[in-house]
Amino acid sequence: KSPIFGPEEVNSVEGNSVSITCYYPPTSVNRHTRKYWCRQGARGGCITLISSEGYVSSKYAGRANLTNFPENGTFVVNIAQLSQDDSGRYKCGLGINSRGLSFDVSLEVSQGPGLLNDTKVYTVDLGRTVTINCPFKTENAQKRKSLYKQIGLYPVLVIDSSGYVNPNYTGRIRLDIQGTGQLLFSVVINQLRLSDAGQYLCQAGDDSNSNKKNADLQVLKPEPELVYEDLRGSVTFHCALGPEVANVAKFLCRQSSGENCDVVVNTLGKRAPAFEGRILLNPQDKDGSFSVVITGLRKEDAGRYLCGAHSDGQLQEGSPIQAWQLFVNEESTIPRSPTVVKGVAGGSVAVLCPYNRKESKSIKYWCLWEGAQNGRCPLLVDSEGWVKAQYEGRLSLLEEPGNGTFTVILNQLTSRDAGFYWCLTNGDTLWRTTVEIKIIEGEPNLKVPGNVTAVLGETLKVPCHFPCKFSSYEKYWCKWNNTGCQALPSQDEGPSKAFVNCDENSRLVSLTLNLVTRADEGWYWCGVKQGHFYGETAAVYVAVEERKAAGSRDVSLAKADAAPDEKVLDSGFREIENKAIQDPRLFAEEKAVADTRDQADGSRASVDSGSSEEQGGSSR
């Protein structure tokens, strides 16, 4: 599919001008290559009319130009003094006309309306309000006032001052007669429909002395704004419908076949299942404007979107609307990353978040998508050192591995952690990605004691048991704080006896705190990593108390105080609820499961030929 995108249809009137914008992926090659506008012939082929290399056809001499905007990935063709001869099928494209890097555009130039003399033209957007003003003379002040619409050869009464309203206008029209000083009456029509367009006649009086005024009402269907976004990226629709609909339900819908427009989200709480976890509707402002952001863009998200206002929360005739045509560029600069990460209760997940590598200094954020009402995304952690209070000790955002990816580690997982999370930065707004955390059956791989109490001035040793599957991994202990997890020295104590069916490659690695002080109180993590890629983690809270009896403390799994959420294993070891991060590259032996949503997307993992948008969890 060609990554070039532009307007499918352009409509104008003789004598007017048009401006046509075409989008392309802003790669270095594309920015500098030839841009063209050509007219398609009846027998195929496409005759160049204008190009970025300076060529202008004689047909366009003095009335057209083509401007490239390489920083935006767009070029614009302006054509003036349009005639009906300009109607036809065109292409805007890159490179050579016949190469296929192009987009088809239909240009329709119509004759201007033939209007009667003294006709006032009203041009109003669909769904809006028009006020048709009708002057009259003093002698007709007490006589009947009326508005007619010309249907074919005959005028049809729309409304009059005696109370008649044409059924097509019921509930959305009124006739106002100004105060005695002003010789004017007005007809106000709300919620304008396309069918309201046409020639109107207003009249005061019914005899030969009546006053008449012609009006031409043009109802404009909104031209869709073109939106060009990358696959896996995000799009924001800003919808400004005006203060008159501030208190009316708002919606965003996507046009399907024909005139149908399927609700994507509305302020009445409806949300299409395909957008679960990846859409937010900003609460509307007092002026009636609102915004919708969609992340994790898919190929099938491309299409025409309408936002509007109607009490039903969906498109109805007469809804004021705004339109967008969304093109999803499959030649995306946003790398594939797992859209699903799996972890077990008590275990951990490591989530990789892509960001624009040109913005390494940007602040990184991670928020939890909440589906209630219009959706919210409360922040959980950021790269400046803020962590939501309820996540203290079990959540960390790391700048590693860097170069376009940061890592979020969440441990002590429970079923409540299942859900959708968004990776954000304060930089490029297009790089917002969504990941779903699923909690699956299984046991955590790392085994640590429950909460541990250390004694002031004494030595504390805390064990962490690593199964043999992690034999090739770097094992570490660190002390958690709100800016990360500071590495601490640890000792390899040899093979662990905590695992059944696990050979000499299992490991017991201990953290030793000498001469414990109050400052040692807090959360400690043990974990595995390979280079800058983090695997599972397990967390232990170390409390510090006054000395009761001399000596050092060597905490075993079985001896540590059991916390309410812990379960004592048959082997005599206890597992605490903990959480860890995982990178698909880390687990060669854990076959990834394909996410059916995007079979075409391979995995970031280089260790496994199996494709996956899902990322394996703590254990299988």
């Epitope: 924001t236 800003h238 937010l280 509707l281 900003n282 915004s291 919708v292 952001v293 954020y365 928020c367 919210r376 995304c377 409360p378 922040l379 950021d382 400046e384 050192g385 803020w386 962590v387 939501k388 209070a389 309820q390 203290e392 968004w422 954000l424 304060n426 709100n482």
Partner: nanobody, 133 residues
């Protein structure tokens, strides 16, 4: 759980100054945006000022901009409101509040403070400020 205790209120003449303090208990003080609200007799409680967790951003009601300054000392778990050029209409009970729920907004990016009192999780008992003319 965070407990908040305000102090520093009192009677002051118009044009004078006061400094309010709010001491917070609990390990997680740095997780909260801290705010000051006030309630004048017979009126609704209104937003006065707020400060991001690290002091990096501050927010003020239009009525106090340029006169009031909010600050915080995370080492002491305390937030302050320095009130200068006081006016009789500043007379009210001043409440300290903690908001632990910054959020992402499609239009505004990360919102660290919400001027709506419903967004705040914890409240102090209040301290009375009376400005006489």
């Amino acid at each position: 759980e965070v407990q908040l205790v305000e102090s520093g209120g009192g009677l002051v003449q118009a044009g004078g100054s006061l400094r309010l303090s709010c001491a917070a208990s609990g390990r997680t003080f740095t997780s909260y945006t801290m705010g000051w609200f006030r309630q004048a007799p017979g009126k609704e409680r209104e937003f006065v000022a707020a400060i991001k967790w690290n002091g990096g951003s501050t927010y003020y009601a239009d009525s106090v901009k340029g006169r009031f300054t909010i600050s915080r000392d995370n080492a002491k778990n305390t937030v302050y409101l320095q009130m200068n050029s006081l006016k009789p209409e500043d007379t009210a009970v001043y409440y300290c509040a903690a908001d632990g729920d910054p959020y992402f907004s499609p239009t505004d990016g990360i919102v660290w403070h919400a001027p709506h009192q419903s967004e705040y999780d914890y409240w102090g008992q209040g301290t009375l400020v009376t400005v006489s003319s």
